[in-house]
């Protein structure tokens, strides 16, 4: 008795965060024995779509020509081989931006901050929202997720960072959203450039010091509770 078929890999191109009206392609990669691919969308009738494999049969393409609210959500895919259906892929969260007006992102006390000190990024929306997200360009885990407590609607969210180090420098944007669908985000805020100057740091290189890239985990203003990435997309502070 053979074990279960290996789960396929699911991804989106050009990415999983798509502006309204833009095209996106969802790919599901299984094995060369695949005869059919199925894509399921959470809270939609299954299957959401079926596709025959592309040669050499190890993957299938699901095309979305123009991103709208209907396409935002959580997807899984499967493939069928002569011995049956595979395990489900890991989920893909397809997020649409442009659902609401853009918030404003600012830095307190200033976007120019000295290494070793603190800075608070403030994301403000015109209308009350219950979820705010912070993105750092070229970060490995780009989205930080702040949900208002007790479902309260708020006009702003604070993202504290301390101590700030050189890797916190870079370009940030924020989004706002409503709790009923975390897959629908506002337009992005205008970019905020955080500039880290000076240094209170030890100037001596230590033997274990490694080169830190912009994609390193130090980019994240980690929260003391619930700081584990959620489905690879968000970090929670709730």
């Amino acid at each position: 008795q053979a074990g279960p078929l290996p789960k396929p890999t699911l991804w989106a191109e050009p990415g999983s965060v798509i502006s309204w009206g833009n095209s996106v392609t969802i790919w599901c990669q299984g094995t060369l024995e695949a005869r059919e691919y199925r894509l399921d969308k959470e809270e939609s009738p299954a299957p959401w779509d079926r596709q025959n494999p592309l040669e050499p049969k190890n993957k299938a393409r699901f095309s979305i020509p123009s991103m709208t609210e209907d396409y935002a959500g959580r997807y899984r895919c499967y493939y069928r081989s002569p011995v049956g259906w595979s395990q489900p892929s890991d989920p893909l969260e397809l997020v649409m931006t442009g659902a609401y007006s853009k918030p404003t992102l600012s830095a307190l006390p200033s976007p120019l901050v000295t290494s070793g000190k603190s800075v608070t990024l403030l994301c403000q929306s015109r209308s009350p929202m219950d979820t705010f997200l912070l993105i750092k360009e070229r970060a490995a885990h780009p989205l930080l997720h702040l949900r208002s407590e007790h479902g309260a609607q708020q006009h702003q969210a604070e993202f504290p960072m301390s101590p700030v180090t050189s890797v916190h420098g870079g370009t940030y944007r924020c989004f706002s959203s409503h709790g009923f669908s975390h897959y629908l985000l506002s337009h992005p805020s205008d970019p905020l450039e955080l500039i880290v100057s000076g240094s209170l740091e030890d100037p001596r290189p230590s033997p274990t010091r490694s080169v830190s890239t912009a994609a390193g985990p130090e980019d994240q203003p980690l929260m003391p509770t619930g700081s584990v990435p959620h489905s690879g997309l968000r970090r929670h502070w709730e």
């Epitope: 307190l108 006390p109 290494s115 070793g116 000190k117 603190s118 608070t120 604070e158 504290p160 960072m161 301390s162 101590p163 180090t165 050189s166 890797v167 209170l200 740091e201 030890d202 230590s206 274990t208 010091r209 490694s210 080169v211 830190s212 390193g216 985990p217 130090e218 994240q220 203003p221 980690l222 929260m223 003391p224 509770t225 700081s227 584990v228």
Partner: antibody, heavy 118, light 107 residues
Framework: EVQLVESGGGLVQPGGSLRLSCAAS????????MHWVRQAPGKGLEWVAY????????YYADTVKGRFTISRDNAKNSLYLQMNSLRAEDTAVYYC???????????WGQGTLVTVSS | DIQMTQSPSSLSASVGDRVTITCRTS??????LNWYQQKPGKAPKLLIY???KLHSGVPSRFSGSGSGTDFTFTISSLQPEDIATYFC?????????FGGGTKLEIK
Amino acid sequence: EVQLVESGGGLVQPGGSLRLSCAASGFTFSSFGMHWVRQAPGKGLEWVAYISSGSSSIYYADTVKGRFTISRDNAKNSLYLQMNSLRAEDTAVYYCARGTGTGAMDYWGQGTLVTVSS
Amino acid sequence: DIQMTQSPSSLSASVGDRVTITCRTSQDISNYLNWYQQKPGKAPKLLIYYTSKLHSGVPSRFSGSGSGTDFTFTISSLQPEDIATYFCQQGNTLPWTFGGGTKLEIK
């Protein structure tokens, strides 16, 4: 469950050296900055040193600068404090603590006692 | 360095009492103020972070407030297990600094 376990404390003569270790488990060690904090017998808490998650940023209290070296090995989930030129006033319980990115330290080890005496 | 002035240094209260500890900083630290509880022979435990956020697993009788330079820590109804020393700590600028502590005793 987050766990931090310090080791390496003991009795050392003034001018001597000691290396403290902190073994971390229950969380993704490589994603968190780490601190050393000490507490002299019957006294308050004193922050000693900080190292960022990727070791790119290191900070020390003025009282230990030039004598202590903080380091980490993310592959081994371990934090270290190399203490040289020890003085009587370095006598304390040394705690390792996990940083949060918000200026707090959310989990602490049980501590290891360092006694500097002739 | 940022100086931390914590008061009172000791406090005696009865079970069920409302207990308040204050912490004043030598410069504005925004909301980067944390509170810890330490019992004899044990490591400190984080109770409150970022002035008013309750750390996971901490009972709701503990709360914090303030901003800038003046901060308050409150136990709404003192329980026997709350007997400990409490410390405030600023996380605004390295080096982190702590208040001198408040030793809380049962009357």
